[in-house]
């Protein structure tokens, strides 16, 4: 039921926007896809959610949303923003989610992001960002999720990530990154998910993933790796690993010995000629093993200690016989 307060709230709804109470005596305001070229001026101070996505907003003035101290989510995706000035988000003390994807930003709006201490989720994907300044995330101590995919990055912004010790998920996919240096993510000890797919990565520092002590998902699919990514050896909690569609020719012996928690590995569409017989040993959690197109494999892998496979796909291989123990090793 509506209370007198919710009536007051709804009277503060901007023209043509859709508004509804959020259940906490605050207001959810949806002004998306209305052809707006500037921000609405008569927003209720009690707004907790503001969706301005899919409009024609090309610039933000300093302090364009005064007094929205209760605003928790601001969506500005799909506009024509090329630059966000210092002070654009001043006073948004409660802001937890900021969506800036699908704009035309060329740089991370460093000054605008300062002091967003409550921010937990930041979307900067699908822009034209080619440079991430070293200190651009330095005040975002609560940040949990960061999207930087589909931009123009050519290298990992190593210094910028040093302050994001609370980060849990990050995507750098669909950029032009060619190398991951040692300790690239050295301070991201809480990171659980890392997407690096669809880049141009051809080389990995041997300690490039050191420090990622919580990582469970690593996606290196669709890159230019020509060697097995041995740097994964530090990822003791890794559960899901993808490096399909690269140029890897061999899976070494004991390839995953440092990753005993692996559940799924995807590495099809690599020109694999050699697979060490011990490569897939001692992976008790592994459920799926797919070796599509590994045309040079002639020996069935030794699956000692890998006893819980539910799906084993070996297409295009040249295995002429199965070991007698294979049925003992599989459930």
């Amino acid at each position: 039921g509506s209370s007198p307060r919710s009536g007051v709230l709804l009277r503060g709804c901007p023209t043509h926007c859709h508004c509804e109470p959020d259940g906490r005596m605050l207001l959810r305001v949806d002004c998306s896809d209305l052809g707006l070229s500037e921000l609405p001026s008569n927003l209720s101070v009690f707004t907790s959610y503001l969706d301005l996505s899919m409009n024609n907003i090309s610039q933000l003035l300093p302090n364009p949303l005064p007094s929205l101290r209760f605003l928790e989510e601001l969506r500005l995706a799909g506009n024509a923003l090329t630059y966000i000035p210092k002070g654009a988000f001043t006073g948004l003390y409660s802001l937890k989610v900021l969506m800036l994807q699908n704009n035309q930003l060329r740089h991370v709006p460093t000054e605008a992001l300062q002091n967003l201490r409550s921010l937990q989720s930041l979307r900067l994907d699908a822009n034209h960002i080619s440079y991430v300044p070293p200190s651009c995330f330095s005040g975002l101590h609560s940040l949990r999720h960061l999207w930087l995919d589909d931009n123009a990055l050519t290298e990992i912004p190593v210094q910028a990530f040093r302050s994001l010790s609370a980060l849990q998920a990050m995507t750098l996919a669909l950029n032009k990154i060619h190398h991951i240096p040692d300790y690239a993510f050295g301070n991201l000890s809480s990171l659980v998910v890392l997407h690096l797919h669809n880049n141009r990565i051809h080389s990995l520092g041997k300690k490039c993933f050191d420090g990622l002590h919580s990582l469970e998902t690593l996606d290196l699919n669709y890159n230019n790796l020509d060697e097995f990514p041995t740097a994964i050896r530090t990822l003791s909690n890794l559960k899901e690993l993808g490096f399909h569609s690269n140029n890897i020719r061999s899976i070494p012996e004991k390839a995953f010995v440092g990753n005993p928690s692996l559940i799924t590995i995807h590495f099809y569409d690599n020109p694999i000629q050699f697979v060490g017989r011990s490569a897939f040993q001692h992976l008790p959690e592994l459920r799926t093993l797919t070796l599509n197109g590994a045309s040079q494999i002639t020996e069935f892998p030794d699956l000692t200690g890998t006893a819980n496979l539910e799906s084993l796909t070996l297409t295009g291989a040249q295995i002429s016989s199965l070991p007698q123990t294979v049925c003992n090793q599989l459930p």
């Epitope: 050295g186 300690k207 420090g211 990822l235």
Partner: antibody, heavy 118, light 111 residues
Framework: EVQLVQSGAEVKKPGASVKVSCKAS????????IEWVRQAPGQGLEWIGE????????DYNEKFKVRVTITRDTSTSTAYLELSSLRSEDTAVYYC???????????WGQGTLVTVSS | DIVMTQSPDSLAVSLGERATINCRAS??????????MHWYQQKPGQPPKLLIY???NLESGVPDRFSGSGSRTDFTLTISSLQAEDVAVYYC?????????FGQGTKVEIK
């Protein structure tokens, strides 16, 4: 609490071998490099090599490569340094340390004095 | 190998005064904006203790009178106000490339 506890002092003859142990506790042993460093009496620090216990990967200082073997036993969270063909100039305190933030050595064992004397 | 050279070899400073130790690497130890240079303190009969990592980051639990600065080849450890318990030998170390190397050490004493 992170701790690295090393084995006791050793006295060896020239040409012999020594094996020093380093037992880790208080953290995930498999996920951090263990580094070995030595310090001759009154001298500075010298890096010997490292091992990543989870994968058995090792790297050695070329100076020691032919005489040093670093191993680990994950079941007991213990790393080992073995140095062969000992000579008097190998007399030193041998330390194990954990490779922490960005490879800095954030926790150290108490040290093991190895004396090589005829 | 990268050679680390510390200066001075020893330093006598009055209590409460500033102590400054320099470390020069024979080649740059910077990579993608990170300086792979760390500082340690060693007291007699004890193992070294990490003070500063990546040139300027204070290790947890280390008093903030210790600070580090520098990049590429030239680095400095500063003790802003020397205390009696700071008497020790201080070492810089690089892990930019194998073999990881240490400076020869700087002995800090009270004047």
């Amino acid at each position: 609490e992170v701790q690295l506890v090393q084995s006791g002092a050793e006295v060896k003859k020239p040409g012999a071998s020594v094996k020093v142990s380093c037992k880790a506790s208080g953290y995930t042993f498999s996920a951090y490099w263990i580094e070995w460093v030595r310090q001759a009496p009154g001298q500075g620090l010298e890096w010997i090599g490292e091992i990543l216990p989870g994968s058995d990967s090792t790297d050695y200082n070329e100076k020691f490569k032919v005489r040093v073997t670093i191993t680990r036993d994950t079941s007991t969270s213990t790393a080992y340094l073995e140095l062969s063909s000992l000579r008097s100039e190998d007399t030193a305190v041998y330390y194990c340390a954990r490779g922490g933030h960005y490879g800095s050595l954030d926790y150290w064992g108490q040290g093991t004095l190895v004396t090589v004397s005829s | 190998d990268i050679v680390m050279t510390q200066s001075p070899d020893s330093l006598a400073v009055s209590l409460g005064e500033r102590a400054t130790i320099n470390c020069r690497a024979s080649e740059s130890v910077d990579n993608y904006g990170n300086s792979f240079m760390h500082w340690y303190q060693q007291k007699p009969g004890q193992p070294p203790k990490l003070l500063i990592y990546l040139a300027s980051n204070l290790e947890s639990g280390v008093p903030d009178r210790f600070s580090g600065s520098g990049s590429r080849t030239d680095f400095t450890l500063t003790i802003s106000s020397l205390q009696a318990e700071d008497v020790a030998v201080y070492y810089c170390q690089q892990n930019y490339e194998d073999p990881f190397t240490f400076g020869q050490g700087t002995k800090v004493e009270i004047k």
